[in-house]
Interface confidence: medium
């Protein structure tokens, strides 16, 4: 996590810094929101858990052409510790649930700010 | 009970300045998106600009009227919102509310808006 | 910079049904809120979210969106409704709000 920030960052990011900016950018994508998101693409719900950010990555990842969320594509890749290709799937997606990218998207967000208010930021 | 004061509020000379407080209680400050809106006489309400929650990133937005020359903040550890007015024009004469805000209550976790004050009044004249 | 767009005056009998509407480019994406604002008085939020009312406000009061429309409909206007009635949106980027211009509703 001592390396996430992307490219405009001059050098590494404390994982508080990291979480926090994460937050900012889902919170930037559905402020105000009612359009649905990525036109209404569906995506495996996931098990908010550890090992999460990769399953989330995972689940996104296979949403393409919705710029709105390809910043938080890239900041997931810099939580998950191995490289996320679409198609690939772990034990955290619950397989047979799908919900909106939107839905997805609120239902990460909340979760982190539970996570940012106790401290976890691994 | 959920309650937002302003106060500050004043006679001030063009080109001068002037600084609003907003005391907020009854409700977790520091998960607040807040707003300020003003009002000028005999008109309609004008958004002024809105600070997020910390967590949010505290993300500040102003009106282009005032960009530059209004600045937004807060301090949560006194549950108290402000804001530094500068180069004060006499076109900022109005009463200006502060209220906690709707867009950002959906996503916090505390039940929001509609919460205003009753608003202070300032007058910009020489 | 981007605009709501509000008529400036509606006039009802009382019992009458007041429609009062709201138009801007970004509505189809963003949320729509209206306030009612009494003479002397803070606004105060009568629907949120396009079709939202929140607790303590009459079931008379409802709304509705439409592409670039949003309208507040008050079924059955009583003289206590008499107010000005604003819409408040955010612009595409949701980053920044705006009031459109204000309503005065005359129940009459």
């Known amino acids: 996590l001592t390396c996430l920030g992307g490219f405009a960052s001059p050098g590494p990011v404390p994982p508080s810094t990291a979480l926090r900016e994460l937050i900012e950018e889902l919170v930037n994508i559905t402020q105000n929101q009612k359009a649905p998101l990525c036109n209404g693409s569906m995506v495996w719900s996931i098990n908010l858990t550890a090992g999460m950010y990769c399953a989330a990555l995972e689940s996104l990842i296979n949403v393409s052409g919705c710029s709105a969320i390809e910043k938080t594509q890239r900041m997931l890749s810099g939580f998950c510790p191995h490289k996320v290709s679409a198609g690939q799937f772990s034990s955290l997606h619950v397989r047979d649930t799908k919900i909106e990218v939107a839905q997805f998207v609120k239902d990460l967000l909340l979760h982190l700010k539970k996570l940012f208010r106790e401290g976890q930021f691994n | 009970e959920v309650q937002l004061v302003e106060s500050g509020g004043g006679l001030v000379k063009p080109g001068g300045s002037l600084r609003l407080s907003c005391a907020a209680s009854?409700?977790?400050?520091?998960?607040?998106?807040m707003s300020w809106v003003r009002q000028a006489p005999g008109k309609g309400l004008e958004w002024v600009g809105r600070i997020r929650s910390k967590i949010d990133g505290g993300t500040i937005n102003y009106a282009a009227p005032v960009k530059g020359r209004f600045t937004i903040s807060r301090d949560d550890s006194k549950n108290t919102l402000y804001l530094q007015m500068n180069s004060l024009k006499t076109e900022d004469t109005a009463v200006y509310y502060c209220?906690?805000?709707?867009?950002?209550?959906?996503?916090?976790?505390?039940?929001?808006?509609?919460?205003w004050g009753q608003g202070t009044t300032v007058t910009v004249s020489s | 910079s981007y605009e709501l767009t509000q008529p400036p005056s509606v006039s009802v009998s009382p019992g009458q049904t007041a429609r009062i509407t709201c138009s801007g480019d970004a509505l189809p994406e963003k949320y729509a809120y209206w306030y009612q604002q009494k003479s002397g008085q803070a606004p105060v939020l009568v629907i949120y979210e396009d079709t939202k009312r929140p607790s303590g406000i009459p079931e008379r009061f409802s709304g509705s969106s439409s592409g670039t429309m949003a309208t507040l409909t008050i079924s059955g206007a009583q003289v206590e409704d008499e107010a000005d009635y604003y819409c408040y949106s955010t612009d595409s980027s949701g980053n920044h709000g705006v009031f459109g211009g204000g309503t005065k509703l005359t129940v009459l």
């Open positions: 209220a906690t805000d709707q867009v950002g209550a959906y996503y916090g976790d505390y039940y929001g808006m509609d919460v």
């Open positions: 009854g409700f977790t400050f520091s998960n607040a998106w």
